[in-house]
């Protein structure tokens, strides 16, 4: 049956046993800045092009054992959530991956900046259709990272990022705090904010909306047909990147402001239990869970 | 995220150094009275001291960025410091990434075209 997360973002009219928008996102290219990925996984084979971009720090620890499957874990799962054949949101979207996170999931602001610059240069050299950039990472507040995101957004690129998994104000983290970026928090099957041990999804006024981010089934790098469940605001951001790809594929001329407005408009309202958030953050945190547009756009989204 | 709201630095550390220009025997001194600022991550464990993003003013050309980077290297060498330019930015933001001692920050902040300098820091998969 359909995974809970795909059911949650699907308009009621399309909730059959399968989630199947066959051509979702086909006009859009989604850039993923993350770990390395297993591009020959059945979920994403032929859908993800691995660029030659790599800018990562050395792994911590003297006895670190590098295993390809572990190095690829995070990125492979997210690529699957965005465009996977069976468990993806925008099954028609093509993706390009840049490696900015090492085998331990760690990167640098500078490496991310160089990655964003690489995307901008690629866009200038070979202009294509709409671009979505998925940044499933977070660090402390960074003026320069936010500035780079702002410049890329002003060049017409849609940036989607994870709010962060620190159970904290997203405004203290980057790129989550960049105003031009679509910042996504995570909710679970009960529409509760996701708890990750003592930590959990970030919140506050720098979050634009929430999306499914707990127990998300997606491609596992353990084998080319394996699946695994992962949780986090990265998974939530991947859902919104997929939804954005589908919206932009249906309406390629959408501006960032219009896309943001549509994401908010079609979101489920006031379903999140706000008691989970600190009292002073409840009024600032948007009570919105991302969803695809309903049947009024049937011809556009489900061709 | 969340457009239409004022930007907030939170605990973000900003060390503002208002510095007069020091010509150091080279042309292109900064305009009188300009202030370049230094920024670093508020979370100490995520800081990566020794690597800095030098961000130049918006309309700075690539050739000026390269010249500013070379100038920093020359001035640092005169003081006995080794520096390494790791990347020159253009296309999104003008500037360069430099590996150098934190002792050189005051010098770097006085360079022409410099808007601000940010110490590198870690980001993590979420």
């Amino acid at each position: 049956s359909i995974p809970w997360n795909l059911e949650r973002i699907t308009p009621p009219r399309y909730r059959a046993d399968e989630y199947q928008p066959p051509d979702g996102g086909s006009l859009v290219e989604v850039y993923l800045l993350d770990t390395s990925i297993q591009s020959d996984h059945r979920e994403i084979e032929g859908r993800v092009m691995v660029t030659d971009f790599e800018n990562v720090p050395e792994e911590d620890g003297t006895r670190f054992h590098r295993q390809a499957s572990k190095c690829d874990s995070h990125g492979t799962h997210l690529a699957g959530v965005v465009s996977g054949r069976d468990a993806g949101v925008a099954k028609g979207a093509s993706m390009r991956s840049l490696r900015v996170l090492n085998c331990q999931g760690k990167g640098t602001v500078s490496g991310t900046l160089i990655g964003l610059e690489f995307i901008r240069k690629s866009q200038l050299v070979q202009p294509v259709g709409p671009l979505v950039v998925l940044l499933p990472l977070a660090g402390g507040y960074s003026r320069v990272l936010n500035a780079a995101c702002q410049r890329l957004a002003r060049a017409g690129v849609v940036l989607v990022t994870a709010a962060g998994n620190f159970r904290d104000d997203a405004c203290l983290y980057s790129p989550a705090s960049a105003p031009e970026v679509i910042t996504v928090g995570a909710t679970n099957a009960q529409d509760q904010p996701v708890t990750l041990g003592t930590l959990g999804t970030n919140f506050g006024r720098c979050v634009d909306l929430f999306a499914p981010g707990e127990d998300i089934i997606g491609a596992s790098s353990d084998c080319s047909t394996c699946f695994v469940s992962q949780s986090g605001t990265s998974q939530a951001a991947a859902h919104v990147a997929g939804i954005a790809a589908m919206m932009l594929s249906a309406e390629p001329e959408l501006t960032l402001a219009e896309l943001r407005q549509r994401l908010i408009h079609f979101s489920a309202k006031d379903v999140i239990n706000e008691a989970w958030f600190p009292e002073d953050q409840r009024v600032l945190t948007p009570n919105l869970v991302a969803a695809l547009p309903p049947s009024t756009h049937e011809n556009l989204y489900f061709q | 995220g969340a457009m239409g709201q004022e930007d907030e630095d939170g605990d973000y550390e900003e060390l503002v150094l208002a510095l007069r220009s020091e010509e150091d025997g080279l042309a292109e001194a900064p305009e009188h009275g300009t202030t370049a600022t230094f920024h670093r991550c508020a979370k100490d464990p995520w800081r990566l001291p020794g690597t800095y993003v030098v961000v130049l003013k918006e309309e700075t050309h690539l050739s000026q960025s390269e010249r500013t980077a070379r100038r920093l290297q020359a001035q640092a060498a005169r003081r006995g410091y080794l520096t390494k330019i790791l990347h020159v930015f253009h296309g999104l933001l003008p500037g360069f990434l430099v590996k150098m001692s934190g002792d050189l920050l005051e010098l770097a902040l006085k360079l022409p075209h410099v808007d601000y300098i940010e110490e590198d820091s870690s980001v993590f998969a979420q």
Partner: antibody
Framework: QVQLVESGGGVVQPGRSLRLSCAAS????????MHWVRQAPGKGLEWVAL????????YYADSVKGRFTISRDNSKNTLYLQMNSLRAEDTAVYYC???????????????WGQGTTVTVSS | QSVLTQPPSVSAAPGQKVTISCSGS????????VSWYQQLPGTAPKLLIY???KRPSGIPDRFSGSKSGTSATLGITGLQTGDEADYYC???????????FGTGTRVTVL
């Protein structure tokens, strides 16, 4: 609910070996780093070892390096501590504890077991 | 011997405030996140504070944490008899590549 239960403690002679286990339940074990911490009778807490969520990295206190091995089986939701060449000074209550998160292992420990007692005596 | 130093004991009357210091160096407190743990007599330790000043859910706001340079401080206001326990600071030490605990402080409610 979230729970850690240690087992395998007991009385052992110096120079011998012992293997401690820690059974985790109520959370996604494979998403968290795990620590062993010990406390000698009447003394303070002493960190022993840490293993990353996927087992790819291990760290040890100098006092146990080369003698103790931390490992985990994510399919069984179990953490282990293999203790070889035991000494009298290894006598303590051994706690397993969950790291606050996988990537931010230096954040500390948020869930603790009740401990298992190891006595090294001839 | 612990690389983080705490006072052996502090005491105050019910309702009063106590502070516990934890002194380290740049390789631990200076550049790493500090946590505080409470150990009630005969029980396992419990996390009180992480990331210098954040409280896990369920920990009352009577407990607070702060950091300055290479020292950290735990504050307990409105002291209650149930707060009688041993308190430990803890942090990662980058030069040791390991976690370190403070020497521990016993809090007595007079």
């Amino acid at each position: 609910q979230v729970q850690l239960v240690e087992s395998g403690g007991g009385v052992v002679q110096p120079g011998r070996s012992l293997r401690l286990s820690c059974a985790a339940s109520g959370f996604t074990f494979s998403s968290f780093g795990m620590h062993w911490v010990r406390q000698a009778p009447g003394k303070g807490l002493e960190w022993v070892a840490l293993i990353w969520n996927d087992g790819s990295n291990k760290y040890y206190a100098d006092s146990v390096k080369g003698r103790f091995t931390i490992s985990r089986d994510n399919s069984k939701n179990t953490l282990y501590l293999q203790m070889n060449s035991l000494r009298a000074e290894d006598t303590a209550v051994y706690y397993c504890a969950r790291a606050i998160a996988a990537l931010y292992y230096y954040y500390g420990m948020d869930v603790w077991g009740q401990g298992t007692t190891v006595t090294v005596s001839s | 011997q612990s690389v983080l130093t705490q006072p052996p004991s502090v005491s105050a009357a019910p309702g009063q405030k106590v502070t516990i210091s934890c002194s380290g160096s740049s390789s631990n407190i200076g550049n790493n996140f500090v946590s505080w743990y409470q150990q009630l007599p005969g029980t396992a330790p419990k996390l009180l504070i992480y990331d210098y000043n954040k409280r896990p859910s369920g920990i009352p706001d009577r407990f607070s944490g702060s950091k300055s340079g290479t020292s950290a401080t735990l504050g307990i206001t409105g002291l209650q008899t149930g707060d009688e326990a041993d308190y430990y600071c803890g942090t990662w030490d980058s030069s040791l590549s390991g976690y370190v605990f403070g020497t521990g402080t016993r809090v007595t409610v007079l």
